[in-house]
Amino acid sequence: LRPSRVHNSEENTMRALTLKDILNGTFSYKTFFPNWISGQEYLHQSADNNIVLYNIETGQSYTILSNRTMKSVNASNYGLSPDRQFVYLESDYSKLWRYSYTATYYIYDLSNGEFVRGNELPRPIQYLCWSPVGSKLAYVYQNNIYLKQRPGDPPFQITFNGRENKIFNGIPDWVYEEEMLPTKYALWWSPNGKFLAYAEFNDKDIPVIAYSYYGDEQYPRTINIPYPKAGAKNPVVRIFIIDTTYPAYVGPQEVPVPAMIASSDYYFSWLTWVTDERVCLQWLKRVQNVSVLSICDFREDWQTWDCPKTQEHIEESRTGWAGGFFVSRPVFSYDAISYYKIFSDKDGYKHIHYIKDTVENAIQITSGKWEAINIFRVTQDSLFYSSNEFEEYPGRRNIYRISIGSYPPSKKCVTCHLRKERCQYYTASFSDYAKYYALVCYGPGIPISTLHDGRTDQEIKILEENKELENALKNIQLPKEEIKKLEVDEITLWYKMILPPQFDRSKKYPLLIQVYGGPCSQSVRSVFAVNWISYLASKEGMVIALVDGRGTAFQGDKLLYAVYRKLGVYEVEDQITAVRKFIEMGFIDEKRIAIWGWSYGGYVSSLALASGTGLFKCGIAVAPVSSWEYYASVYTERFMGLPTKDDNLEHYKNSTVMARAEYFRNVDYLLIHGTADDNVHFQNSAQIAKALVNAQVDFQAMWYSDQNHGLSGLSTNHLYTHMTHFLKQCFSLSD
């Protein structure tokens, strides 16, 4: 289902998108992800805020928690204990970084319909979760981990050394949260809740980024974050496991780091429980081309964790970094020793492999000039995964099932032909034992979420079809969208072009390039969106193009690793190449071409504007990186190595925006940044502005006081209004 297109007879009733539509979120869509609690039951928060339990087999629904109870503590979120005796209610949500937040938690006893009194939880809590079985609670408060055997019991304190900005237990520090895990938690229950594993991050030696937060006070506050920039001292990580049944008996036991990893700076990348007495840890060298997966077993006699060298599996990249954006995680099979994992095959495409003893003897499960993206679930007889194989469009995602019980394994695409026009980009959510699953389709048509039988793949019901959105779009002149490819010098450049509703190839249109272009990213995706660029095409008559160049993902290692140790070169070249090809198509006004991007996209748009090609009349950089020496170690060094003389300092210096200050003289440049950006620090734009001033180059700038990397709230409206004025002025479009 595609939203209705323009027909001449309807032209009077149809209207273009307005900027107001976008800023009000008028055309936003809903998705439905069941909160699975068994093979055939799930919870969902209804529109009126009741917590409802659905039983798929009987078709019955039950309100297990009323909106009245939710409202009594102003709860915005909930979590049912696995034994279904208690529910935690979360309120006073206070955002910290990308994933982290603090909140107040109340425990509601379903048995008597009352809140648990006595031994209440402290506030605010940094993270809280139930054990996978029963109703034990683990939580993090003031950087320390606590355990409760039952919600009403007094807590047992597991760690004591937690200290703000110094030692983090059970939660990540800034860089692990953003660039490595990436989660708000760093603790993991074993499958039956016998053990609790957790990470301790020591940030004592990490340099601190400090910035002003202006607030309303007479004196601004200073925000201090231990933030390792490229080449700086990194957090020191240790992993511990504690027996939660007798936590005081031997206390937390440290899991040993593989010798080949411990010999120099390293990272912990993930922890996967296999059984209650077997755990799998993944480690990564600071130079991120070597990863080690280590399987450890509990030694009952010594009460310690043993990680034999024979259970160490090494993953190494000779052409780039290990993994895609992150090193993939293993999905263990029922024998509790073999596992499935996505990594590069000999042809340089990421595929599913089955590892039984050594990585060298891995059995390749999928293959082809496409990539396996995610393993959703492994059951006794099936493996469910997503890939971009179907019809050779890298920007699509379909869900496949491989039968692993039979030989040779047979493969079936579950989603390819379900709603072919409407749905080409899926994710999935599986119940226990994959008895049922939900499919969430993100486009290119209006998103739809459906429920399916895990054995037959039969659709059972529609969970969310966005009917209101469909009706609201009936009288809107939406732009047309095309996804195509350019073949240039043995490189395939996929692009998405967004065209005005009455597009006419014989006319000339202004062109706006929207770029992200970061390593292992993908912008050209078959997804639905009604956003700012939709408005620019619909109302302002612009053509907008997104191009996936070298360094982008899911098209093989040759394209992905092309940017290794050389950020800021090929990404920019490929945007420029694409623009030249677009001009050749004949409908672009080459005197009216602009480029804009945010974050990494702001870096690329800045470099493109300063490329000296004369292609771009103007451009915008929102919260750009300006020098890789200013950005986080974990991210930057993955792609650039270290900023040292004997490593890659030269390219760190060559790839700054500041080095090209002179080249901004002949373009209109709008530079935008939030002053409280914890991620890409305001320092980046401050340095660009300083270099432009020193070169006596005119430019426009806007800062957003106390705003972070997301520029949210009222700033969003101001931002898009401001950028719209800038582009309309650049393209000589009347207001």
Epitope: E41, L53, T58, Q60, L80, D83, R84, Q85, L110, S111
Partner: nanobody, 123 residues
Framework: QVQLQESGGGLVQPGGSLRLSCAAS????????MGWFRQAAGKERELVAA???????LYADNVKGRFTISRDNARNTVYLLSNSLKPEDTAVYYC?????????????????WGQGTQVTVSS
């Protein structure tokens, strides 16, 4: 171990009422969650209502406001009062018990069962 025996079923007109009873043996009745399930011909057995040891109740949304579950721990009995009965309420009604939470809607999660009592709603 708990034994359960239902009573009170029968034929009732649409719009009518019925009170089902379930008598339980065993001294620890008060510590069990109790539930009423029903099974119509050719259909899955479904939870209609449940009551926890602490007295909180759970109802299927399509019987909420019409059915009331209650328990009398002194008499080791659980009741299901059904008002405004409809033809689609026709089924065999079963009493079930389990230790722990009442908030389980799959019949396999309830280990103890009565024999069932037929309820027919028809004019």
């Amino acid at each position: 171990q708990v034994q359960l025996q239902e009573s009170g079923g029968g034929l009732v007109q649409p719009g009518g009422s019925l009170r089902l009873s379930c008598a339980a043996s065993g001294r620890t009745f008060g510590s069990y969650a109790m539930g009423w399930f029903r099974q119509a011909a050719g259909k899955e057995r479904e939870l209609v209502a449940a009551i926890s040891a602490g007295g909180s109740t759970l109802y299927a949304d399509n019987v909420k406001g019409r059915f009331t579950i209650s328990r009398d721990n002194a008499r080791n009995t659980v009741y299901l009062l059904s008002n405004s009965l409809k033809p689609e309420d026709t089924a065999v009604y079963y009493c079930a018990a389990r230790r722990g939470s009442a908030y389980y809607t799959n019949h396999i999660d309830w280990p103890y069962w009565g024999q069932g009592t037929q309820v027919t709603v028809s004019s």
